[in-house]
């Protein structure tokens, strides 16, 4: 069956190997014909013909491993219902870095887990990030096939210290915004509590001055400024945070007594109602939704029901007198 | 260590009643919000009701409200589910749960039959 | 009420392997802060749930790392690196982005 005339050259689609002249005569309803499995991978149930709604599971060869849905459905027009499926190796290949930069350990693969530094020679450091983590068949973070070594400055500056700060001798400074930001960083949407306005910032910039300052500068979100939801609550948890009892460090964030940093991204999660801990004396009386009656909620319980822009009016700090 | 132990189910004819009981221990009861969680026989779980810290808020799927009533002692350190008017569709097994910053659902007890059959 | 849709139903097999399941949501379970929460449990051959995954790709306390969970918006997939023979179970996905919350209809995992 070719939904085009067979007076030329057979097609060959760009994903398959195999040329429409090449596939068995079969009817559209009575079944599909064997499904081209993907590089390194075989079909564990095979066989020529396929009935309509059999599924055909995908298996990789030893040293690699299905990624994706690996499942395939035969259709009734005969074709396949099939999802991105790939197999992709259990281990690590060494990766291709330029010249300047030195690979340790050094070795053709690693397995899950084993990470590798990148470094460079004397007075130069990795420009981006030095310590690679083998995840699969590929490295976290990805490997830049660009990356390459820059006049040691800010990482020298920085060494074992925390964000916005730099080495100086045996002990951790403040960055200078102005001299250790020149290089480039990803933007922030950043609250000023001082001028009590909202602004774009650097990141490089937005720590140094945060290490500063700590008290001034409150992160709102990853990304410009733009006005909607993301911005009105940023502000919100940061007018709510001056009583916060809680303050994690996350990131670029700071997790208060509603949140909880997350490991995998790094950033603040709002809890839900019910995960918030009964204590500490931050209460406040509101009133909920269209309800008239005052009820006494702690401030964790408060973050999480404006995070979830439920409805709610905070009438005064402190349990409600009724 | 959270030890949270149901009450023993049991079989009840439609339109019946019955109360279940959670006693909990390894944590301060009345510092958490508490909640029930069933499966039916052979069936995913569903969420059922939620109670706050004092017995003052609960809620409730939409399936069970009128009927079930979440409740709480506190000084018992034991949570209730008062279930009437009893379908053949409430049959199934009832777990107690406490959330954590984690989840909502991070500690379950180890589940109690209910069977709704004439 | 939201729908989690749980693929494949029942997962057959060898230790060793890799696995995947896909939990797909008939709406999206980002909310208007950047927040989504989808869980993972396993439940054991007559025991109670258990956690192993919170906040999309957050491994439970105690959760041992051959377990990871990924996507956004409405597909999400919780992979066992290495499956092991005391992985068998019932594998939920549960999100708490709208009320109720809901769970998907489980995939069982067998050995072979």
């Known amino acids: 069956f070719s939904i085009m005339e067979n007076n030329g050259q057979p097609c060959i689609n760009d994903d398959e190997e195999m040329k429409e002249v090449d596939l068995p005569e079969i009817e559209a309803d009575s079944g599909c014909p064997q499904p081209v499995p993907p590089e390194n991978g075989f079909i564990r149930n095979e066989k020529q013909l396929y009935l309509v709604g059999e599924d055909v599971e995908i298996s990789c060869l030893t040293g690699f491993e299905t990624v994706g849905y690996q499942y395939f459905r035969c259709l009734p027009d005969g074709t396949w219902r099939q999802g991105d499926v790939e197999c992709q190796r259990t281990e690590c290949i060494k990766p291709v870095v330029q010249e300047v930069l030195t690979i340790t350990p050094f070795q053709r693969l690693y397995r899950i887990g084993e990470s590798i530094e990148l470094t460079c020679p004397k007075g130069f450091v990795v420009a981006g990030p030095s310590r690679y983590t083998c995840q699969g068949n590929s490295w976290t973070p990805p490997i830049s096939n660009s990356l390459t070594c820059e006049k040691d400055t800010l990482t020298k500056l920085k060494g074992h210290c925390q964000l916005g700060q730099k080495q100086s001798g045996s002990e951790c400074i403040c960055m200078s915004p102005e001299e250790d930001c020149s290089h480039h960083s990803e933007d922030l949407c950043v609250f000023d509590t001082d001028s009590n306005d909202y602004f774009t910032s650097p990141a490089c910039k937005f720590l140094a001055e945060k290490c500063l300052n700590n008290q001034q500068l409150h992160f709102l979100h990853i990304g410009s400024c733009q006005d909607g939801r993301q911005l009105e609550w940023g502000l919100e948890r940061t007018r709510l945070s001056s009583n916060s009892t809680k303050k994690e460090s996350c990131g670029y964030d700071t997790c208060y007594d509603w949140e909880k940093c997350s490991a995998s991204t790094s950033k603040c999660v709002c809890l839900l109602p019910p995960q918030c801990f009964k204590g500490g004396n931050q209460l406040y009386c509101v009133k909920m939704g269209s309800s008239t009656s005052e009820k006494t909620l702690n401030i964790c319980e408060v973050g999480t029901i404006r995070c979830a822009n439920r409805k709610m009016e905070i009438l005064h700090p402190g349990k409600c007198l009724a | 260590e959270v030890q949270l132990v149901e009450s023993d189910g049991g079989l009840v004819q439609p339109g019946g009643s019955l109360r279940l009981s959670c006693v909990a221990s390894g944590f301060t009861f009345s510092d958490y919000y508490m909640a029930w969680v069933r499966q039916a026989p052979g069936k995913g779980l569903e969420w059922v009701a939620t109670i706050n810290y004092d017995g003052s808020s609960t809620y409730y799927r939409e399936s069970v409200k009128g009927r079930f009533t979440i409740s709480r002692d506190n000084a018992k350190r034991t949570l209730y589910l008062q279930m009437d008017s009893l379908r053949a569709e409430d049959t199934a097994v009832y777990y107690c749960?406490?959330?954590?910053?984690?989840?909502?659902?991070?500690?379950w007890g180890q589940g109690t039959l209910v069977t709704v059959s004439s | 009420d939201i729908v989690l849709t749980q693929t494949p139903l029942t997962l057959s097999v060898t230790p060793g392997q890799s696995v995947s399941i896909s939990c797909r949501s008939s709406?999206?379970?980002?909310?208007?802060?950047?927040?989504?929460?989808l869980y993972w449990y396993l439940q054991k051959p007559g025991q109670s749930p258990q956690l192993l995954i919170y906040?999309?790709?957050d491994l439970g306390s105690g959760v041992p790392n051959r377990f990871s969970g990924s996507g956004s918006g409405t597909d999400f997939t919780l992979k066992i690196s290495r499956v092991e023979a005391e992985d068998v179970g019932v594998y939920y996905c549960?999100?708490?982005?709208?009320?109720?919350?809901?769970f998907g209809a489980g995939t069982r995992l067998e050995i072979k």
């Open positions: 549960m999100q708490a982005s709208h009320a109720p919350y809901t």
């Open positions: 709406q999206s379970l980002l909310n208007d802060v950047g927040n989504t929460y």
């Open positions: 906040l999309v790709s």
């Open positions: 749960a406490r959330p954590s910053t984690e989840a909502l659902f991070a500690y």
